[in-house]
């Protein structure tokens, strides 16, 4: 069976939107009005992995681009990157570990935990216009809570 996917945008808990910053980086900033069209649309795929009521394994691709968020070790540190893939083979039900995030729903907010690096989360900074990154702390200065807005296909 083909993998189930939906199109969505994400905003952090301070209502910052995610936009492209160069070919392989996302940044978070406040957008209004027509600028909202700059925000990236994700194709969120529901992939194979350990699942529970509040935890669902997903992969986050950029809609109509052959790019996926992935988590790898760089200089011994878990790092978030945008990785190019062969569009003929992705998305797929069995994604490589580095592409998988546990989508965790808590109090109507979403967290995206790396399946490869437990307790590391997709994060944004309090400051404007800073890169989206993989952070190893929750509840500190950095933001790990998001809301999801559905986008029609």
């Amino acid at each position: 069976a083909p993998v189930r996917s939906l199109n969505c945008t994400l905003r952090d808990s301070q209502q910052k939107s995610l936009v492209m910053s160069g070919p392989y980086e996302l940044k978070a900033l406040h957008l209004q009005g027509q600028d909202m069209e700059q925000q990236v649309v994700f194709s969120m795929s529901f992939v194979q992995g350990e699942e529970s009521n509040d935890k669902i394994p997903v992969a986050l691709g950029l809609k109509e681009k052959n790019l996926y968020l992935s988590c790898v070790l760089k200089d011994d540190k878990p790092t978030l990157q945008l990785e190019s893939v062969d569009p003929k083979n992705y998305p797929k039900k069995k994604m490589e570990k580095r592409f998988v995030f546990n989508k965790i729903e808590i109090n109507n907010k979403l967290e995206f935990e790396s399946a490869q690096f437990p307790n590391w989360y997709i994060s944004t900074s309090q400051a404007e216009n800073m890169p989206v990154f993989l952070g190893g702390t929750k509840g500190g200065q950095d933001i790990t809570d998001f809301t999801m807005q559905f986008v029609s296909s």
């Epitope: 194979q48 992995g49 350990e50 790898v72 070790l73 990785e83 190019s84 893939v85 062969d86 083979n89 069995k94 490589e96 570990k97 580095r98 399946a115 490869q116 690096f117 437990p118």
Partner: antibody, heavy 120, light 107 residues
Framework: EVQLVESGGGLVQPGGSLRLSCAFS??????????VGWIRQAPGKGLEWVSH???????SYNPSLKGRFTISKDTSRNTVYLQMNSLRAEDTAVYFC????????????WGQGTLVTVSS | DIQMTQSPSTLSASVGDRVTITCRAS??????LSWYQQKPGKAPKLLIY???KLHSGVPSRFSGSGSGAEFTLTISSLQPEDFATYFC?????????FGQGTKLEIK
């Protein structure tokens, strides 16, 4: 010091089954990011990745196996298993287990291998 | 599946020579490539990972380079213990696939 030791190989008839074991020491398969894979080598041939299991139980298989093999782990016994069913002559190979950490993989430590011969 | 093609299949060289082995992928594999050395009757040993990072304990005469779909393993000055078979492995996409091997033999 990390060690991996394979066992369970031997002569089996076509259509038969065999369970290989990979007993390891020097690391824990409950450590996040840790994985153990099976790689085989037919006589005089190259290496072929067979299967892999991560610390969290996530499994991967080479699709060429057509679902005949199953990987599993017993974390408390520090052992990974490869259950091989419906064996064919082309499954004849030395089977190695090897340790890696994180994806993308590179296999840091290897066992010495166990020979599986499928023949009537 | 991603096909990995190594060249040459066999390489004859002498102690002290500089040798290069090439591994080509059928598609872009980023830098997700590792190299292994295997001697007859023994298990493979990791030499290089992430295309160019030397595994601990591996002599500095071994080096790796490349990106995308073409990669090389270089031995700057062959030692007697380097005569063996070398394999590359791509970790970009499941199923993970090896090159067919390059046998390095004494000239």
């Amino acid at each position: 010091e990390v060690q991996l030791v394979e066992s369970g190989g031997g002569l089996v008839q076509p259509g038969g089954s065999l369970r290989l074991s990979c007993a390891f020491s020097g690391f824990s398969l409950s450590t996040s990011g840790m994985g153990v894979g099976w790689i085989r080598q037919a006589p005089g041939k190259g290496l072929e990745w067979v299967s892999h299991i991560w610390w969290d139980g996530d499994e991967s298989y080479n699709p060429s196996l057509k679902g005949r093999f199953t990987i599993s782990k017993d974390t408390s016994r520090n052992t990974v298993y490869l259950q091989m069913n419906s064996l064919r002559a082309e499954d004849t190979a030395v089977y190695f287990c090897a340790r890696n950490r994180y994806d993308p993989p590179w296999f840091v430590d290897w066992g010495q291998g166990t020979l599986v011969t499928v023949s009537s | 599946d991603i096909q990995m093609t190594q060249s040459p299949s066999t390489l004859s060289a002498s102690v002290g020579d500089r040798v290069t082995i090439t591994c080509r992928a059928s598609q872009d594999i980023s830098n997700y490539l590792s190299w292994y050395q295997q001697k007859p009757g023994k298990a493979p040993k990791l030499l290089i990972y992430y295309t160019s990072k030397l595994h601990s304990g591996v002599p500095s005469r071994f080096s790796g380079s490349g990106s995308g779909a073409e990669f090389t393993l270089t031995i700057s000055s062959l030692q007697p213990e380097d005569f063996a078979t070398y394999f590359c492995l791509q970790g970009k996409m499941l199923p993970w696939t090896f090159g067919q091997g390059t046998k390095l033999e004494i000239k």
